[in-house]
């Protein structure tokens, strides 16, 4: 693979990662695939500092991140360990709420208007953030 040393045009560099912020919405799976086609992944939040950075750029808008529990346990799309990692859920969340009437529960995580996280129906068309790491040889993203 080829190593990327600077971020592509229209991406924002921060702490050796590149971020791209959508301005329109897609379902979580479409957003996930979109990032993969950019040789990136949905954003994985590993620290309070990164949380603040992303929150600053997205504003008070529901925005998908690379965290889901569609196969059971919560998983980050890049393999980062969920249990030991950074979390910023809203109080009482995640709740896998079934009361929305859309069928099933809530399996995909997003930033809410105050930046804290909520689980929601994966089909909702929210904005999303792609992330790719600098100084890392390009490789196939991990399978879900």
């Amino acid at each position: 693979g080829s190593e990327r040393t600077c971020c592509p045009v229209n991406w924002v560099e921060h702490e050796r990662s590149c971020y791209w912020f959508s301005r329109s919405g897609k379902a979580w799976a479409d957003a996930d695939n979109y990032c993969r086609l950019e040789d990136a992944h949905l954003v994985v939040v590993t620290s309070w500092e990164e949380q603040k950075f992303v929150q600053h750029h997205i504003g008070p808008v529901n925005t998908w991140m690379g965290l889901h529990d569609q196969n059971g346990p919560w998983k980050w799309v890049d393999g980062t360990d969920y249990e030991t990692g950074f979390k910023n859920w809203r109080p009482e969340q995640p709740d896998d709420w079934y009361g929305h009437g859309l069928g099933g529960g809530e399996d995909c995580a997003h930033f809410t208007d105050d930046g804290r996280w909520n689980d929601d129906v994966c089909q909702r068309p929210y904005r999303w953030v792609c992330e790719t790491e600098l100084d890392k040889a390009s490789q196939e993203p991990p399978l879900l």
Epitope: G1, P8, V9, W20, D30, Y34, R36, L37, E38, D39
Partner: antibody, heavy 123, light 109 residues
Framework: EVQLLESGGGLVQPGGSLRLSCAAS????????MTWVRQAPGKGPEWVSV????????FYADSVKGRFTISRDNSKNTLYLQMSSLRAEDTAVYFC????????????????WGQGTMVTVSS | GVQMTQSPSSLSASVGDRVTITCRAS??????LNWYQQKPGKAPKLLIY???SLQSGVPSRFSGGGSGTDFTLTISSLQPEDFATYYC???????????FGQGTKLEIK
């Protein structure tokens, strides 16, 4: 000049294989996802497959999954489509196209197309 | 995935006419809608992207509109070179499987 040029089409028997190539010029090939689209005679375009700029991510239409393989050689600015277990319904003109996304273009669209190469599957 | 339906499938018109082609999505696709023109023996050519934005080099007589599920392509005054087949495409789904409409063939009356 931005250009895509397909080659490799021809007549093949059912069950046979064929490899299509698409030579790109005039843009930074490795920066763009690339796609294959086919068009059966008298029909509309049908998306077939897409590959990310590095080649690390690939996607396929259900109709070709497990039979077709998309790949690219960025050192040669070339896109490929390996087709196997070909069927009569795969008969079509095959186009390669640049898939420009809104990360680098003002749109998500297939903005540059080749002239197409004809694949005929018949005994 | 989202299914796209175009109407009419064919249309006869004269030079100078104003024509409108419609495209309907099976669910909301926001503004993820492109229009292509294709002439016999040629590849499709991008005309309109993001529902209403004109691709560079495309004449201003072409315009697009709509959002959500219903979209239109309008040609304000048909020119001889506009007789072709027009396709809509959604890029809401990634990858864009079943993304093209079935086409509208614009013929000379």
């Amino acid at each position: 000049e931005v250009q895509l040029l397909e080659s490799g089409g021809g007549l093949v028997q059912p069950g046979g294989s064929l490899r299509l190539s698409c030579a790109a010029s005039g843009f930074t090939f490795s920066s763009y996802a690339m796609t294959w689209v086919r068009q059966a005679p008298g029909k509309g375009p049908e998306w077939v497959s897409v590959i990310s700029g590095s080649g690390g991510s690939t996607f396929y239409a259900d109709s070709v999954k497990g039979r077709f393989t998309i790949s690219r050689d960025n050192s040669k600015n070339t896109l490929y489509l390996q087709m196997s277990s070909l069927r009569a319904e795969d008969t079509a003109v095959y186009f390669c196209a640049r898939y420009c996304s809104s990360t680098r273009c003002p749109y998500d669209a297939f903005d540059i197309w080749g002239q197409g190469t004809m694949v005929t599957v018949s005994s | 995935g989202v299914q796209m339906t175009q109407s009419p499938s064919s249309l006869s018109a004269s030079v100078g006419d104003r024509v409108t082609i419609t495209c309907r999505a099976s669910q909301s696709i926001s503004g993820y809608l492109n229009w292509y023109q294709q002439k016999p023996g040629k590849a499709p050519k991008l005309l309109i992207y993001a529902a209403s934005s004109l691709q560079s080099g495309v004449p201003s007589r072409f315009s697009g509109g709509g959002s959500g599920t219903d979209f239109t392509l309008t040609i304000s005054s048909l020119q001889p070179e506009d007789f072709a087949t027009y396709y809509c495409q959604q890029t809401y789904n990634t990858p864009p499987e079943r993304s093209f409409g079935q086409g509208t063939k614009l013929e000379i009356k």
